[in-house]
């Protein structure tokens, strides 16, 4: 049977259906790939140019292979088994009305099915399987792979590699709240918040009294101590870590190969020797990088630094004075850490709304 002979795969959405917003299409495919990565060791990375392992396209009729689309209804899409070139690619009939709901044809459900083929799965004769050849609507928000699907995909790739377990909870030491504590970097990681300091990090669930501490090397042996900036793109399960002129990508808690990469590949000028803090704003789809008295803004959709940057922090973030240790995005606010204190900042109204101790997250 056909399967990919590597764990890390790339995909590219070559073109977009006009039926939906681009960001909805991006999100749907990210979630469709996640359905398969959740139950296997496979990891998927989106490319914006060049040839990817899995090319995704929307087309009418004849579109470069022998399998012409047939107009509305009938064949909704097709995909090729793993391999080079056209193999692994997934084609969607543009004559369908693609949606994210029960109306028209639900793109997520068809994408999960077609990507199953792209990963090497054949059709199933089990009507509960997503690989059953006939389309039927299921609620995407409650969608689960059938036991058959999981068994079949794991027969090709095995079960997921367990992320290293974080150490069991412990209460903060009694001295913790009495220290004037500063952090190197702070970011959400899924539902948790990670507070990096030297060679370790604290992590906790907001609202939970328990605090946990883990050394960086015990969970990610390839990541150095002294992380200086971090941010998460939660919709992609991606965590970015920065130290000096390098950055690392952690995907689903697993470090990606081919990292670290140079921060200059992101568009920083040569004068930038390290990033003090970074934060991803999901509403704007921008990353804000804080460097001394300035900040840079990076567009994650275009994978480009925005023009006309850097800009002065003090001018564009009223009430914020450099230098910044760390920034956290949480519930539509930025938490800007400076020494033993943090400023709660509302980016919508561009103002500081609270001043707190850095350790307020720990129930201090």
């Amino acid at each position: 049977r056909s399967r990919w002979m590597k764990r890390y795969l790339t995909y590219r959405i070559y073109n977009y259906t006009p039926d939906m917003k681009r960001e909805d299409v991006d999100y749907i495919f990210q979630k469709a790939f996640q359905v398969w990565s959740d139950v296997t060791p496979l990891r998927f990375r989106k490319l914006h140019k060049d040839e990817a392992d899995i090319m995704i396209l929307f087309a009418f009729g004849a579109h470069g292979d022998f399998n012409y689309f047939d107009g509305k209804g009938g064949t909704l899409a097709h995909a090729f088994y793993p391999g080079p070139g056209i193999q692994g690619d997934a084609h969607f009939d543009e004559a369908e009305t693609w949606t994210k709901s029960f109306q028209g044809t639900n793109l997520f459900l068809v994408a999960v099915h077609e990507l199953g083929h792209s990963l090497g799965l054949q059709h199933s004769n089990n009507p509960k399987s997503i690989m059953y050849p006939t389309y039927r609507y299921l609620n995407p928000s409650t969608f689960r792979l059938s036991a058959d699907d999981i068994r079949n995909i794991q027969s090709l790739y095995g079960a997921p590699v367990k992320p290293p377990s974080l150490t069991k909870p412990s209460s903060p030491p009694s001295t913790f709240c009495h220290q004037s504590l500063s952090f190197d970097a702070v970011t959400t990681v899924g539902e948790k918040i990670f507070f990096f300091k030297d060679w370790f990090f604290w992590w906790k669930l907001p609202g939970s009294p328990a605090t946990n501490i883990t050394s960086i090397s015990s969970i990610w042996p390839s990541i150095p101590s002294g992380i200086q900036a971090a941010y998460e793109i939660e919709s992609r399960n991606q965590l970015f870590l920065f130290k000096d002129e390098k950055y690392w990508l952690i995907n689903n808690l697993v470090p990606e190969p081919h990292y670290p990469r140079s921060i200059y590949s992101l568009g920083f000028s040569a004068s930038v020797k390290k990033v003090d803090a970074a934060v991803f704003d999901p509403l704007r789809q921008k990353v804000y990088f804080f460097v001394d008295k300035h900040y840079w803004r990076y567009d994650v959709r275009q994978e480009l630094m925005d023009p006309a940057y850097p800009k002065l922090i003090s001018t564009h973030f009223p009430g914020i004075k450099p230098k910044i240790d760390a920034v956290l995005y949480f519930k539509r606010h930025y938490y800007i850490f400076q020494g033993a204190y943090q400023l709660e900042y509302d980016p919508l109204f561009r103002r500081v709304t609270k001043t707190l101790k850095s350790t307020s997250w720990f129930g201090c």
Epitope: H63, G64, D65, F66, Q87
Partner: antibody
Framework: EVQLLESGGGLVQPGGSLRLSCAAS????????MHWVRQAPGKGLEWVSY????????HYADSVKGRFTISRDNSKNTLYLQMNSLRAEDTAVYYC???????????????WGRGTLVTVSS | DIQMTQSPSSLSASVGDRVTITCRAN??????LNWYQQKPGKAPELLIY???SLQSGVPSRFSGSGSGTDFTLTISSLQPEDFATYYC?????FGQGTKLEIK
């Protein structure tokens, strides 16, 4: 090593019939889409027909539709092209070519046979 | 239906020359274009698939580029064994061929 060997070509009169065979080895024949491509003397390449791995799906160029039939015998690792109602313009070297595996054909011909010459003349 | 237009139909060049052959589709074929080399009396051989991927065993002086409707095959430094006919192809459609001859 992948090998494709065509046979069955020859001289035939207009309106006559001929059956070409292509013996395949070096790969799991039943997993792959297979094609026939032809080349008239001194001319370019022209795709003729393809068949899916199980033989259930076939596709033909307009120029041969209704006259040619592609088939396969996976137990014998052999591809066939039954050519009826032959015309002078069917004179060509006929090549069999291997495509990618799976339910759909890409038309990526990664291995070709040496070809067999079919001459239609009175 | 999709049509492929290949140019030039013939080309004279010398050993060591850089040569470019182009292929144009009348509608987008994404990156689904292949290039073949055929020598007299022989079967065609796959050189480039998916517009830019080099088939195993093909010398690196051959390269392909393009996507959508416009594609090129480039031979960076012609060798004596490269004088042949070249075809672009997508699915059931071949270009008319480019005969590369010694100047």
């Amino acid at each position: 090593e992948v090998q494709l060997l065509e046979s069955g070509g020859g001289l035939v009169q207009p309106g006559g019939s001929l059956r070409l065979s292509c013996a395949a080895s070096g790969f799991t024949f039943s997993d792959y889409n297979m094609h026939w491509v032809r080349q008239a003397p001194g001319k370019g390449l022209e795709w003729v027909s393809y068949i899916g791995p199980s033989g259930g799906y076939t596709h033909y160029a307009d120029s041969v539709k209704g006259r040619f039939t592609i088939s396969r015998d996976n137990s014998k690792n052999t591809l066939y092209l039954q050519m009826n109602s032959l015309r002078a313009e069917d004179t060509a070297v006929y090549y069999c070519a291997k495509d990618i595996r799976g339910a759909y054909s890409s038309g990526l011909f990664d291995y070709w046979g040496r070809g067999t010459l079919v001459t239609v003349s009175s | 239906d999709i049509q492929m237009t290949q140019s030039p139909s013939s080309l004279s060049a010398s050993v060591g020359d850089r040569v470019t052959i182009t292929c144009r589709a009348n509608q987008s074929i994404y990156t689904y274009l292949n290039w073949y080399q055929q020598k007299p009396g022989k079967a065609p051989e796959l050189l480039i698939y998916a517009a830019s991927s080099l088939q195993s065993g093909v010398p690196s002086r051959f390269s392909g580029s393009g996507s959508g409707t416009d594609f090129t095959l480039t031979i960076s430094s012609l060798q004596p064994e490269d004088f042949a006919t070249y075809y672009c192809q997508q699915a059931g459609i071949f270009g008319q061929g480019t005969k590369l001859e010694i100047k």
